[in-house]
């Protein structure tokens, strides 16, 4: 990526890292308002299976692994990207490496959920305080989960689906920060590992993933009021290990793997019409990206 200053524009969809033949160091940003892509400063170490989030206008890349011809190293790294300077800087590492991690943000704190280190599938969860540059373990999940989808709604952290080392999962659980405890919620209709999970209009959406047999294009959403999962329109492409985010009331899914091809496709879901449309293509196909949107 270029090392010049990034243009000072509004809300962008950032995609970091990913995998195509090897872990990638790309940082690119999509501007939905004009359909353009920006090539930004590379990650300092290539990684896939990472997660992305934004706190205080800064983009964080969390966990993953560097799968390269030279070897395969799971990552405990937390790195911070400043859009104003177009530069990455390292932060305090997590307590353990976490590949295929999920992350969520509550009250400016980053929660790192599950993931794997070698053949160890974590149920542990840790919280990062940016102002102190410190990680602290919180209560572990009730289930070991890698390829877990994580979302925050009403200051509660939801961990959805994944793989426990033996089975792909349709189960989901919710973390209550004030109580420091996890509780199971209604299971999804579909087993999903490596799904895209996000929040839109008071619902948690789970898109795509892998059910242990096939990649999925189905999408379902959880209504916290009724505690039920309901299917919505399917994506055009089957995909697992996809990136997902919400931008101006619409869901964007980026890339992923369809069982044969690394997708460059970016689809957008409009909840008003319950339809998916192809909106752009990434500069190259990839799976296992970290995705986040800058704040206003």
């Amino acid at each position: 990526g270029s090392m010049g200053h990034a243009p000072k524009v509004g809300r962008l969809i950032y995609t970091a890292g990913g995998y195509f033949r090897q872990s990638l160091s790309y940082l690119e940003a999509y501007n939905p308002s004009d359909g353009t892509w920006l090539d930004l400063a590379d990650l300092q170490v290539p990684r896939s299976g990472l997660a992305g989030c934004v706190v205080g206008g800064l983009l964080y890349a969390v966990g993953g692994r560097n799968n390269s011809p030279d070897g395969n190293t799971d990552s405990s790294a937390l790195d911070c990207y400043n859009p104003m300077t177009n530069q990455w800087s390292p932060c305090a590492p997590m307590s353990v490496p976490r590949n295929r991690i999920g992350v969520g943000v509550i009250d400016g704190h980053i929660y790192a959920v599950g993931g794997s280190h070698g053949c160890i599938h974590h149920n542990s969860v840790e919280r990062y305080e940016p102002e102190r540059d410190e990680w602290h373990l919180v209560a572990p999940m009730l289930t070991r989960r890698i390829g877990v989808g994580v979302a925050v709604l009403n200051r509660l952290l939801y961990a959805v689906g994944g793989f426990d080392g033996t089975n792909r999962l349709n189960s989901a659980e919710c973390y209550y920060p004030e109580r420091n405890e996890w509780r199971m919620i209604t299971a999804m209709n579909t087993i999903r590992s490596g799904a895209g999970v996000c929040v839109l209009h008071n619902c948690i959406y789970a898109a795509g993933g892998y059910d242990g047999q096939d990649q999925l294009n189905s999408v379902e959403r959880y209504d916290v009021e009724t505690e039920t999962w309901t299917f919505v329109a399917p994506m055009k492409h089957r995909r697992s290990a996809l990136g997902i985010t919400v931008h101006q009331g619409r869901i964007y899914v980026l890339g992923g793997y369809d069982g044969h091809t690394f997708l460059d496709s970016v689809e957008c879901y409009d909840p008003d019409t319950d339809t998916w449309s192809e909106v752009t293509r990434m500069t190259s196909g990839r799976s296992g990206v970290g995705v986040a949107v800058t704040m206003e």
Partner: antibody, heavy 120, light 107 residues
Framework: EVQLVESGGGLVQPGGSLRLSCAAS????????IHWVRQAPGKGLEWVAS????????LYAKSVAGRFTISADTSKNTAYLQMNSLRAEDTAVYYC?????????????AGQGTLVTVSS | DIQMTQSPSSLSASVGDRVTITCRAS??????VAWYQQKPGKAPKLLIY???SLYSGVPSRFSGSRSGTDFTLTISSLQPEDFATYYC?????????FGQGTKVEIK
């Protein structure tokens, strides 16, 4: 019945290329990690490469990294090992295997193997 | 890379004997160890995975155990069809590595 049938082996000169195929029946290759394991004549087993069905990520032994490529075509229910820049030390029987879903890189079921001979 | 040191390299035993084969990992591999049986000209067959789990269809005379970084395959009562070469494998971290094999021969 689960079956894996390897093909594509043969005699090739050093520096040459071969593509091995592994045709699966009785299960979907999309439902398992697929591995290639090899065995040089009179020697032990060596893990070569794996492909993850969920992410598409591949892993390679250092001895073959950059020369070999593992891939899968779910529409044909077949996995492949593309072998380039072959060396004499790549001479071996190559086995395709699926894992058991409970322990990665565990060759729960392997095919009969295909012999690759690299010699001038 | 993690080394798996297997011993003995060969052993002679009689039908009905109790046979023990060990593998030592050069570093911690948790319980991510499998054991295989291979007969000449044939593909390896999985016996044990996750150190001690018996793979489906494998006779119960085969068992596996772990003590730290030491792993053991035990055949409680050797049968004629058990004369073969046995390999351990670690899949804790990549590259996955095998032991050098133990050939079980008829005494």
């Amino acid at each position: 019945e689960v079956q894996l049938v390897e093909s594509g082996g043969g005699l090739v000169q050093p520096g040459g290329s071969l593509r091995l195929s592994c045709a699966a029946s009785g299960f979907a290759i999309s439902a398992s990690s697929i591995h290639w394991v090899r065995q040089a004549p009179g020697k032990g087993l060596e893990w070569v490469a794996s492909i993850d069905p969920e992410t598409g990520e591949t892993l390679y032994a250092k001895s073959v990294a950059g020369r070999f490529t593992i891939s899968a075509d779910t529409s044909k229910n077949t996995a492949y090992l593309q072998m380039n820049s072959l060396r004499a030390e790549d001479t071996a029987v190559y086995y395709c295997a699926r894992d058991n879903g409970r322990a990665r890189a565990t060759a729960a079921y392997a095919g009969q193997g295909t012999l690759v001979t690299v010699s001038s | 890379d993690i080394q798996m040191t297997q011993s003995p390299s060969s052993l002679s035993a009689s039908v009905g004997d109790r046979v023990t084969i060990t593998c030592r990992a050069s570093q911690s591999v948790s319980s991510a160890v499998a054991w295989y049986q291979q007969k000449p000209g044939k593909a390896p067959k999985l016996l044990i995975y996750s150190a001690s789990s018996l793979y489906s269809g494998v006779p119960s005379r085969f068992s596996g155990s772990r003590s730290g970084t030491d792993f053991t395959l035990t055949i409680s009562s050797l049968q004629p069809e058990d004369f073969a070469t046995y390999y351990c494998q670690q899949s804790y971290s990549f590259p996955s590595t095998f032991g050098q094999g133990t050939k079980v021969e008829i005494k």
